[in-house]
Interface confidence: low
Protein backbone atom coordinates (compact mmCIF):
# COMPACT_ATOMS: atom_id res chain seq x y z
CA UNK A 1 0.00 0.00 0.00
CA UNK A 2 1.52 3.30 -1.07
CA UNK A 3 -0.34 6.37 0.11
CA UNK A 4 0.02 10.08 -0.50
CA UNK A 5 -0.71 12.13 2.57
CA UNK A 6 -1.96 15.66 2.05
CA UNK A 7 -1.20 17.81 5.05
CA UNK A 8 -1.73 21.53 5.64
CA UNK A 9 1.93 22.09 6.50
CA UNK A 10 3.47 22.92 3.15
CA UNK A 11 4.42 19.34 2.32
CA UNK A 12 1.68 18.41 -0.09
CA UNK A 13 4.09 16.28 -2.10
CA UNK A 14 5.02 14.24 0.96
CA UNK A 15 4.65 10.53 0.35
CA UNK A 16 4.14 8.03 3.11
CA UNK A 17 4.81 4.36 2.53
CA UNK A 18 3.00 2.04 4.89
CA UNK A 19 4.55 -1.41 4.92
CA UNK A 20 1.86 -3.83 6.01
CA UNK A 21 2.02 -7.59 6.39
CA UNK A 22 -0.33 -9.68 4.32
CA UNK A 23 -3.07 -11.15 6.47
CA UNK A 24 -5.68 -13.81 5.85
CA UNK A 25 -8.96 -12.08 5.12
CA UNK A 26 -10.68 -13.60 8.13
CA UNK A 27 -8.20 -12.33 10.70
CA UNK A 28 -7.02 -8.94 11.83
CA UNK A 29 -3.54 -8.36 13.25
CA UNK A 30 -2.06 -5.36 14.98
CA UNK A 31 0.35 -5.11 12.04
CA UNK A 32 -2.53 -4.05 9.79
CA UNK A 33 -3.25 -1.02 11.93
CA UNK A 34 -2.01 2.21 10.42
CA UNK A 35 0.57 4.09 12.43
CA UNK A 36 -0.12 7.69 13.41
CA UNK A 37 1.13 10.43 11.14
CA UNK A 38 4.34 12.16 12.22
CA UNK A 39 4.29 15.97 12.24
CA UNK A 40 7.61 17.80 12.32
CA UNK A 41 8.32 21.47 12.99
CA UNK A 42 11.72 23.15 12.97
CA UNK A 43 11.82 25.85 15.63
CA UNK A 44 14.02 28.73 14.50
CA UNK A 45 16.45 26.10 13.15
CA UNK A 46 17.56 25.53 16.72
CA UNK A 47 15.78 22.23 17.20
CA UNK A 48 13.06 20.14 15.56
CA UNK A 49 10.17 18.31 17.20
CA UNK A 50 8.62 15.39 15.34
CA UNK A 51 5.50 14.27 17.15
CA UNK A 52 2.67 11.79 16.75
CA UNK A 53 -0.61 11.08 18.48
CA UNK A 54 0.31 8.26 20.86
CA UNK A 55 -3.27 8.01 22.08
CA UNK A 56 -4.39 6.76 18.66
CA UNK A 57 -2.80 3.39 19.44
CA UNK A 58 -5.27 0.75 20.62
CA UNK A 59 -2.99 0.01 23.58
CA UNK A 60 -0.09 2.03 25.03
CA UNK A 61 2.86 1.51 22.68
CA UNK A 62 6.34 2.98 22.78
CA UNK A 63 6.73 3.57 19.06
CA UNK A 64 10.30 4.16 17.87
CA UNK A 65 11.53 6.73 15.37
CA UNK A 66 14.40 6.53 12.90
CA UNK A 67 15.40 9.16 10.39
CA UNK A 68 17.81 9.85 7.57
CA UNK A 69 18.31 12.22 4.67
CA UNK A 70 17.55 10.90 1.21
CA UNK A 71 20.22 11.09 -1.54
CA UNK A 72 22.65 13.09 0.56
CA UNK A 73 25.85 12.88 2.55
CA UNK A 74 23.66 12.29 5.60
CA UNK A 75 21.84 9.19 4.41
CA UNK A 76 22.88 6.95 7.32
CA UNK A 77 19.89 5.77 9.36
CA UNK A 78 19.83 7.47 12.76
CA UNK A 79 17.93 6.44 15.88
CA UNK A 80 16.07 9.05 17.85
CA UNK A 81 18.28 9.97 20.77
CA UNK A 82 15.85 12.26 22.63
CA UNK A 83 12.27 11.02 22.85
CA UNK A 84 9.33 13.15 23.95
CA UNK A 85 6.76 11.45 26.16
CA UNK A 86 3.06 11.74 26.82
CA UNK A 87 1.91 9.89 29.93
CA UNK A 88 5.10 7.81 29.88
CA UNK A 89 4.56 6.71 26.27
CA UNK A 90 6.74 7.96 23.42
CA UNK A 91 4.95 10.68 21.48
CA UNK A 92 7.76 12.45 19.68
CA UNK A 93 11.43 12.95 19.03
CA UNK A 94 13.52 16.10 19.39
CA UNK A 95 16.46 16.67 17.02
CA UNK A 96 19.13 19.25 17.74
CA UNK A 97 20.55 21.90 15.43
CA UNK A 98 23.46 19.82 14.19
CA UNK A 99 21.03 17.11 13.03
CA UNK A 100 18.90 19.49 10.93
CA UNK A 101 19.69 19.83 7.23
CA UNK A 102 17.00 22.02 5.73
CA UNK A 103 17.54 21.55 2.03
CA UNK A 104 17.82 17.78 1.95
CA UNK A 105 14.82 15.44 1.92
CA UNK A 106 14.19 14.32 5.49
CA UNK A 107 12.91 10.77 5.83
CA UNK A 108 11.26 9.81 9.09
CA UNK A 109 10.20 6.28 9.95
CA UNK A 110 7.88 5.29 12.76
CA UNK A 111 7.92 1.68 13.90
CA UNK A 112 6.19 -0.57 16.38
CA UNK A 113 9.02 -2.48 18.09
CA UNK A 114 6.67 -5.31 19.02
CA UNK A 115 5.65 -5.69 15.37
CA UNK A 116 8.73 -4.61 13.38
CA UNK A 117 6.89 -5.04 10.06
CA UNK A 118 4.42 -2.39 11.20
CA UNK A 119 6.16 0.76 10.12
CA UNK A 120 5.41 3.95 8.22
CA UNK A 121 7.82 6.22 6.36
CA UNK A 122 7.27 9.87 5.45
CA UNK A 123 9.42 12.26 3.45
CA UNK A 124 9.44 15.92 4.50
CA UNK A 125 10.88 19.14 3.16
CA UNK A 126 12.14 20.75 6.33
CA UNK A 127 12.52 24.21 4.79
CA UNK A 128 8.73 24.27 4.59
CA UNK A 129 8.35 23.43 8.27
CA UNK A 130 10.38 26.20 9.91
CA UNK A 131 8.66 28.27 12.56
CA UNK A 132 10.75 31.28 13.63
CA UNK A 133 10.70 32.80 17.08
CA UNK A 134 8.44 35.78 17.52
CA UNK A 135 9.89 39.15 16.45
CA UNK A 136 11.65 41.05 19.21
CA UNK A 137 12.70 44.57 20.15
CA UNK A 138 9.81 46.40 18.50
CA UNK A 139 10.53 50.12 18.31
CA UNK A 140 8.51 53.05 17.03
CA UNK A 141 9.72 56.45 15.95
CA UNK A 142 8.16 59.43 14.25
CA UNK A 143 9.19 60.11 10.68
CA UNK A 144 7.07 63.23 10.55
CA UNK A 145 4.21 64.87 12.40
CA UNK A 146 1.75 62.26 11.18
CA UNK A 147 3.96 59.33 10.12
CA UNK A 148 5.20 56.47 12.32
CA UNK A 149 7.79 53.81 11.52
CA UNK A 150 7.81 50.43 13.25
CA UNK A 151 11.02 48.38 13.35
CA UNK A 152 11.76 44.97 14.85
CA UNK A 153 14.39 42.26 15.00
CA UNK A 154 14.36 38.54 14.29
CA UNK A 155 16.87 35.93 15.29
CA UNK A 156 17.56 35.17 11.62
CA UNK A 157 19.31 36.98 8.86
CA UNK A 158 16.24 38.76 7.66
CA UNK A 159 15.99 37.84 4.00
CA UNK A 160 14.45 34.47 4.86
CA UNK A 161 11.42 35.92 6.61
CA UNK A 162 8.26 37.71 5.66
CA UNK A 163 6.18 39.47 8.26
CA UNK A 164 2.64 40.40 9.13
CA UNK A 165 2.05 43.64 11.03
CA UNK A 166 -1.23 44.23 12.83
CA UNK A 167 -2.22 47.52 14.37
CA UNK A 168 -5.30 49.12 15.82
CA UNK A 169 -6.33 52.06 17.93
CA UNK A 170 -8.28 51.76 21.14
CA UNK A 171 -11.29 52.87 19.11
CA UNK A 172 -11.06 49.95 16.67
CA UNK A 173 -13.03 46.73 16.86
CA UNK A 174 -10.52 44.77 14.79
CA UNK A 175 -6.90 44.76 13.68
CA UNK A 176 -5.67 46.23 10.42
CA UNK A 177 -3.13 43.94 8.74
CA UNK A 178 -0.21 44.70 6.44
CA UNK A 179 2.23 42.23 4.87
CA UNK A 180 5.90 43.22 4.99
CA UNK A 181 8.80 41.65 3.11
CA UNK A 182 12.24 40.84 4.50
CA UNK A 183 13.01 44.52 5.20
CA UNK A 184 11.36 44.22 8.64
CA UNK A 185 10.05 47.75 8.84
CA UNK A 186 6.58 49.22 8.48
CA UNK A 187 5.41 52.80 8.03
CA UNK A 188 2.01 54.13 9.01
CA UNK A 189 1.59 57.32 6.99
CA UNK A 190 -1.33 58.87 8.82
CA UNK A 191 -1.44 58.79 12.60
CA UNK A 192 -4.17 60.42 14.66
CA UNK A 193 -2.46 62.01 17.64
CA UNK A 194 -5.62 61.75 19.72
CA UNK A 195 -5.63 57.96 19.59
CA UNK A 196 -3.54 55.26 21.24
CA UNK A 197 -2.13 52.71 18.78
CA UNK A 198 -1.12 49.12 19.43
CA UNK A 199 1.19 47.23 17.06
CA UNK A 200 2.28 43.60 16.92
CA UNK A 201 4.21 41.51 14.39
CA UNK A 202 4.66 37.88 13.46
CA UNK A 203 7.03 36.28 10.97
CA UNK A 204 7.14 33.37 8.57
CA UNK A 205 9.94 31.46 6.80
CA UNK A 206 8.80 32.36 3.29
CA UNK A 207 9.38 32.81 0.34
CA UNK A 208 13.11 33.12 -0.34
CA UNK A 209 14.47 30.29 1.80
CA UNK A 210 11.45 28.05 2.17
CA UNK A 211 7.70 27.84 1.77
CA UNK A 212 6.50 27.53 5.34
CA UNK A 213 2.82 28.00 6.04
CA UNK A 214 3.07 28.47 9.79
CA UNK A 215 3.63 31.86 11.37
CA UNK A 216 5.61 32.57 14.49
CA UNK A 217 3.86 33.59 17.66
CA UNK A 218 2.91 37.26 17.83
CA UNK A 219 5.48 39.63 19.24
CA UNK A 220 4.82 41.43 22.48
CA UNK A 221 2.67 44.45 21.56
CA UNK A 222 4.05 47.96 21.47
CA UNK A 223 1.95 51.08 22.06
CA UNK A 224 2.04 54.64 20.79
CA UNK A 225 0.01 57.72 21.52
CA UNK A 226 -2.18 59.29 24.14
CA UNK A 227 -3.65 57.28 26.96
CA UNK A 228 -7.08 55.79 26.37
CA UNK A 229 -9.65 58.51 25.81
CA UNK A 230 -12.65 58.60 28.12
CA UNK A 231 -14.77 59.42 25.12
CA UNK A 232 -13.95 56.17 23.34
CA UNK A 233 -17.34 54.74 22.30
CA UNK A 234 -15.91 51.26 21.78
CA UNK A 235 -14.67 51.12 25.36
CA UNK A 236 -18.10 52.22 26.58
CA UNK A 237 -19.61 49.39 24.55
CA UNK A 238 -17.24 46.92 26.18
CA UNK A 239 -18.05 48.19 29.64
CA UNK A 240 -21.80 48.23 29.14
Amino acid sequence: LNTTILTPNGNEDTTADFFLTTMPTDSLSVSTLPLPEVQCFVFNVEYMNCTWNSSSEPQPTNLTLHYWYKNSDNDKVQKCSHYLFSEEITSGCQLQKKEIHLYQTFVVQLQDPREPRRQATQMLKLQNLVIPWAPENLTLHKLSESQLELNWNNRFLNHCLEHLVQYRTDWDHSWTEQSVDYRHKFSLPSVDGQKRYTFRVRSRFNPLCGSAQHWSEWSHPIHWGSNTSKENPFLFALEA
Partner: nanobody, 120 residues
Framework: QVQLQESGGGLVQPGGSLRLSCAAS????????MSWVRQAPGKGREWIAS???????FYADSVKGRFTISRDNAKNTLYLQLNSLKAEDTAMYYC??????????????RGQGTQVTVSS
Protein backbone atom coordinates in the same frame (compact mmCIF):
# COMPACT_ATOMS: atom_id res chain seq x y z
CA GLN B 1 34.18 19.08 8.24
CA VAL B 2 32.81 22.13 6.43
CA GLN B 3 35.56 24.50 5.33
CA LEU B 4 35.09 27.86 3.60
CA GLN B 5 37.98 30.13 2.64
CA GLU B 6 37.32 33.60 1.31
CA SER B 7 39.81 35.65 -0.71
CA GLY B 8 39.94 38.65 -3.03
CA GLY B 9 39.35 41.48 -0.61
CA GLY B 10 41.45 44.61 -0.46
CA LEU B 11 41.54 48.38 -0.56
CA VAL B 12 39.71 49.98 -3.47
CA GLN B 13 38.61 53.48 -4.40
CA PRO B 14 34.94 54.50 -4.55
CA GLY B 15 33.46 53.40 -7.86
CA GLY B 16 35.98 50.58 -8.17
CA SER B 17 35.48 46.82 -8.45
CA LEU B 18 36.58 43.64 -6.71
CA ARG B 19 35.90 39.95 -7.15
CA LEU B 20 35.65 37.84 -4.03
CA SER B 21 36.08 34.06 -4.09
CA CYS B 22 35.14 31.38 -1.59
CA ALA B 23 36.72 27.93 -1.86
CA ALA B 24 34.49 25.27 -0.28
CA SER B 25 35.21 21.76 0.92
CA UNK B 26 33.83 19.15 3.28
CA UNK B 27 30.31 19.05 1.85
CA UNK B 28 28.50 18.57 -1.44
CA UNK B 29 28.93 22.06 -2.84
CA UNK B 30 26.73 21.57 -5.91
CA UNK B 31 23.64 20.81 -3.80
CA UNK B 32 24.23 23.55 -1.23
CA UNK B 33 22.59 26.94 -1.11
CA MET B 34 25.34 29.53 -0.69
CA SER B 35 25.31 33.09 0.59
CA TRP B 36 27.50 36.12 1.15
CA VAL B 37 27.06 38.16 4.29
CA ARG B 38 29.06 41.09 5.58
CA GLN B 39 29.76 42.81 8.86
CA ALA B 40 30.91 46.42 9.12
CA PRO B 41 32.84 47.49 12.22
CA GLY B 42 30.49 47.90 15.16
CA LYS B 43 27.45 46.74 13.18
CA GLY B 44 25.40 43.57 12.92
CA ARG B 45 25.79 40.98 10.23
CA GLU B 46 24.04 41.89 6.98
CA TRP B 47 22.93 39.42 4.33
CA ILE B 48 24.15 40.41 0.85
CA ALA B 49 23.18 37.72 -1.64
CA SER B 50 22.27 34.05 -2.01
CA UNK B 51 22.53 31.56 -4.82
CA UNK B 52 20.55 28.36 -4.59
CA UNK B 53 21.69 24.98 -5.80
CA UNK B 54 19.38 25.36 -8.79
CA UNK B 55 21.03 28.66 -9.72
CA UNK B 56 18.40 31.12 -8.46
CA UNK B 57 19.89 34.33 -7.07
CA PHE B 58 18.66 36.85 -4.50
CA TYR B 59 20.13 40.19 -3.46
CA ALA B 60 19.70 42.69 -0.66
CA ASP B 61 18.32 46.02 -1.88
CA SER B 62 21.51 47.78 -0.81
CA VAL B 63 23.61 45.90 -3.40
CA LYS B 64 21.09 45.07 -6.13
CA GLY B 65 22.43 46.06 -9.55
CA ARG B 66 25.98 46.49 -8.22
CA PHE B 67 26.92 43.05 -6.89
CA THR B 68 26.64 39.70 -8.67
CA ILE B 69 26.78 36.30 -7.00
CA SER B 70 27.81 33.24 -9.02
CA ARG B 71 29.21 29.76 -8.51
CA ASP B 72 31.42 27.22 -10.26
CA ASN B 73 30.35 23.77 -9.09
CA ALA B 74 33.26 22.09 -10.90
CA LYS B 75 35.69 24.15 -8.83
CA ASN B 76 33.62 24.15 -5.61
CA THR B 77 33.91 27.92 -5.60
CA LEU B 78 31.48 30.74 -4.86
CA TYR B 79 32.07 34.26 -6.23
CA LEU B 80 30.86 37.77 -5.52
CA GLN B 81 31.55 40.47 -8.09
CA LEU B 82 31.49 43.92 -6.46
CA ASN B 83 31.06 46.90 -8.81
CA SER B 84 30.43 50.60 -8.20
CA LEU B 85 31.75 50.27 -4.67
CA LYS B 86 30.81 52.84 -2.05
CA ALA B 87 32.37 53.75 1.29
CA GLU B 88 29.44 52.08 3.05
CA ASP B 89 30.41 48.75 1.46
CA THR B 90 33.46 48.65 3.73
CA ALA B 91 33.13 45.49 5.81
CA MET B 92 34.37 41.99 6.42
CA TYR B 93 32.77 39.71 3.81
CA TYR B 94 31.94 36.10 4.63
CA CYS B 95 30.58 33.25 2.57
CA UNK B 96 28.26 30.79 4.26
CA UNK B 97 26.67 27.49 3.32
CA UNK B 98 23.17 26.22 3.32
CA UNK B 99 22.33 24.54 6.55
CA UNK B 100 22.11 27.66 8.64
CA UNK B 101 23.34 30.38 6.34
CA UNK B 102 20.61 32.71 7.51
CA UNK B 103 20.88 31.92 11.18
CA UNK B 104 22.58 34.88 12.71
CA UNK B 105 24.49 33.44 15.63
CA UNK B 106 25.75 30.25 14.02
CA UNK B 107 29.40 30.69 13.05
CA UNK B 108 30.21 27.08 12.26
CA UNK B 109 29.20 27.29 8.62
CA ARG B 110 30.93 30.41 7.43
CA GLY B 111 34.54 31.23 6.63
CA GLN B 112 37.02 33.54 8.32
CA GLY B 113 36.13 36.40 5.99
CA THR B 114 37.96 38.76 3.66
CA GLN B 115 38.19 42.49 4.34
CA VAL B 116 36.92 45.00 1.77
CA THR B 117 37.83 48.65 2.36
CA VAL B 118 36.46 51.36 0.09
CA SER B 119 38.32 54.62 0.58
CA SER B 120 39.84 57.37 -1.48
Amino acid sequence: QVQLQESGGGLVQPGGSLRLSCAASGFTFSSAHMSWVRQAPGKGREWIASIYSGGGTFYADSVKGRFTISRDNAKNTLYLQLNSLKAEDTAMYYCATNRLHYYSDDDSLRGQGTQVTVSS
